[in-house]
Interface confidence: low
């Protein structure tokens, strides 16, 4: 008995060939001996089977002695043994229809699990192997699970179902919903405008949800909600914003926040959460703000940074075009009795300058000027 594998929703063509290369009488029946279709001369006739409206043949092939049975929009329950009766012979074809679906939506939040479920006919014992877009292989039986989805899992998953040494391939498009970056740091001089951007790593036609930015200032004992907003079809509308600081938010994607001034009291870490409609769980992006201030008070030139800095970052004070006068892995450095000239305060990581603030020290009889 010939075995043919089909995919749910697809069309399958079961072949039946006569030895005579001409149009002769034939019938296709199911295992219950119910007629599906046949011919009466050059006319196609259909029996009362459940395939009635989905069964067809190719009349153009009849003259060549070929009498195919075409079944459209395959269903799992179409799995059956089909019998072609032609020239007093019976040809049997076993059709096995499989379906592979993502249990949840195919749009999943980063960190969520993807479960692929194989629908298969009773009595079959298929094996499934799926390959993710990043080349990871997973194997299983009726269900396959991938926990902790990552951004790189977005794309087309290719799954191969194997049964009776035959195989059928499924392709499922998975979209992992996440921000492009899990975390970001913004370095700013005191008084500068701060731009926070939260680009998404996916595109969908309609995006609806709500979000909030919670902020933990370094100087504060507890975190505070800075802004809440709604997202409707990619349009952003602010629901509530604190008076201090008074953040501004862009009306379009990507999500964009503006802090009018970087001040030491704002330095710290924020967590932007985005809850999408019809999704359980939230998208998260951490954002950090580091603020630098250079000041001269009487005979003391001081440079300070506030916010989440790594212990390996170096803070330096140097006179322009000269060697650093002071350089420490600390959040404040100072020089007593600085000589006149343009001083630079630098925050650097392995020689790469992250943040720079200049302060002009005038001769002792005048007051300092900040450019």
């Amino acid at each position: 008995k010939k075995v043919v594998l089909g995919k749910k929703g697809d069309t399958v063509e079961l072949t039946c060939t006569a030895s005579q290369k001409k149009s002769i009488q034939f019938h296709w029946k199911n295992s219950n001996q119910i007629k599906i279709l046949g011919n009466q001369g050059s006319f196609l006739t259909k029996g009362p089977s459940k395939l009635n409206d989905r069964a067809d043949s190719r009349r153009s092939l009849w003259d060549q002695g070929n009498f195919p049975l075409i079944i459209k929009n395959l269903k799992i329950e179409d799995s059956d043994t089909y019998i072609c009766e032609v020239e007093d012979q019976k040809e049997e074809v076993q059709l096995l229809v499989f379906g592979l679906t993502a249990n949840s939506d195919t749009h999943l939040l980063q960190g969520q699990s993807l479960t692929l479920t194989l629908e298969s006919p009773p009595g079959s014992s298929p094996s499934v192997q799926c390959r993710s877009p990043r080349g990871k292989n997973i194997q299983g039986g009726k269900t396959l699970s991938v926990s902790q989805l990552e951004l790189q899992d977005s794309g087309t998953w290719t799954c191969t179902v194997l049964q009776n040494q035959k195989k059928v391939e499924f392709k499922i498009d998975i979209v992992v919903l996440a921000f492009q970056k899990a975390s970001s740091i913004v370095y700013k001089k005191e008084g500068e405008q701060v731009e926070f951007s939260f680009p998404l790593a996916f595109t969908v036609e309609k995006l609806t949800g709500s979000g909030e930015l919670w902020w933990q200032a370094e100087r504060a004992s507890s975190s505070k909600s800075w802004i809440t907003f709604d997202l409707k079809n990619k349009e952003v509308s602010v629901k509530r914003v604190t008076q201090d600081p008074k953040l501004q938010m862009g009306k379009k994607l990507p999500l964009h926040l503006t802090l009018p001034q970087a001040l030491p009291q704002y330095a710290g870490s924020g967590n932007l959460t985005l809850a999408l409609e019809a999704k359980t769980g939230k998208l998260h992006q951490e954002v950090n703000l580091v603020v630098m201030r250079a000041t001269q008070l009487q005979k003391n030139l001081t440079c300070e940074v506030w916010g989440p800095t790594s212990p390996k970052l170096m803070l330096s004070l140097k006179l322009e075009n000269k060697e650093a006068k002071v350089s420490k892995r600390e959040k404040a450095v100072w020089v007593l009795n600085p000589e006149a000239g343009m001083w630079q305060c630098l925050l650097s990581d392995s020689g790469q300058v992250l943040l720079e603030s200049n302060i002009k020290v005038l001769p002792t009889w005048s007051t300092p000027v900040q450019p």
């Epitope: 009362p48 409206d53 329950e77």
Partner: antibody, heavy 120, light 107 residues
Framework: QVQLLESGPGLVKPSETLSLTCTVS????????WSWIRQPAGKGLEWIGR???????NYNPSLKSRVTMSIDTSENQFSLNLSSVTAADTAVYYC??????????????WGQGTTVTVSS | DIQMTQSPSSLSASVGDRVTITCQAS??????LNWYQQKPGKAPKLLIY???TLETGVPSRFSGSGSGTDFTFTISSLQPEDIATYYC?????????FGGGTKVEFK
């Protein structure tokens, strides 16, 4: 045994919106299509549309522009809204379960029906 | 939409009579046809599906036949409790459509 009960106002003013709710008891709202059918007095049955647990809907094209259906799985209820009603919308409104099985697709469980009159 | 034309719209018969109702579809609907019974003030009840299959618990005096566009519903021996309106309904296509109904009453 699954039972359906329609509820909603019996009188609606012309141009207003007719709102009905169907409560499913004795079974789950999952895995079935749930439909609304109406019958003007002394006349035949008209299928209005149906809704699935996912919220997906199919409406009769003749009413599509005025019909909205919704489903609340937590309350085991589904609803019908018919806007801009006229006297022609006066009818008995039924909710029903659409059941599918081999060789079979039919409305196997029906509510008792609720009479809605459109009048000022 | 598929139009379902039922005839007659009403008929009078006596207990024990054989009653036949026909239903014609505006296009081929294969066997996708149901027959419902509706008693006054009640919701319809499914009697026959797939044109000819009797729903569980329905008396065998009810039968259905036909396929394609022409269908027949028969009550082999009319009983008092069969006084009702009978509707055919196609499920080949959405929207689901019903015939106009046949009212069966006593002579």
């Amino acid at each position: 045994q699954v039972q359906l009960l329609e509820s909603g106002p019996g009188l609606v003013k012309p141009s207003e919106t007719l709102s009905l709710t169907c409560t499913v008891s004795g079974g789950s709202i999952s895995s079935y299509y749930w439909s609304w059918i109406r019958q003007p007095a002394g006349k035949g049955l008209e299928w209005i549309g149906r809704i699935y647990i996912s919220g997906s809907t199919n409406y009769n094209p003749s009413l599509k522009s005025r019909v909205t259906m919704s489903i609340d799985t937590s309350e085991n209820q589904f609803s019908l809204n018919l806007s801009s009603v006229t006297a022609a919308d006066t009818a008995v409104y039924y909710c029903a379960r659409e059941l599918e099985r081999p060789y079979y697709y039919g409305m196997d469980v029906w509510g008792q029906g609720t009479t809605v009159t459109v009048s000022s | 939409d598929i139009q379902m034309t039922q005839s007659p719209s009403s008929l009078s018969a006596s207990v024990g009579d054989r009653v036949t109702i026909t239903c014609q579809a505006s296009q081929d609907i294969s066997n996708y046809l149901n027959w419902y019974q509706q008693k006054p003030g009640k919701a319809p009840k499914l009697l026959i599906y797939n044109a000819s299959t009797l729903e569980t618990g329905v008396p065998s005096r009810f039968s259905g036949s036909g396929s394609g566009t022409d269908f027949t519903f028969t009550i082999s021996s009319l009983q008092p409790e069969d006084i009702a309106t009978y509707y055919c309904q196609q499920y080949d296509n959405l929207p689901l459509t019903f015939g106009g109904g046949t009212k069966v009453e006593f002579k």
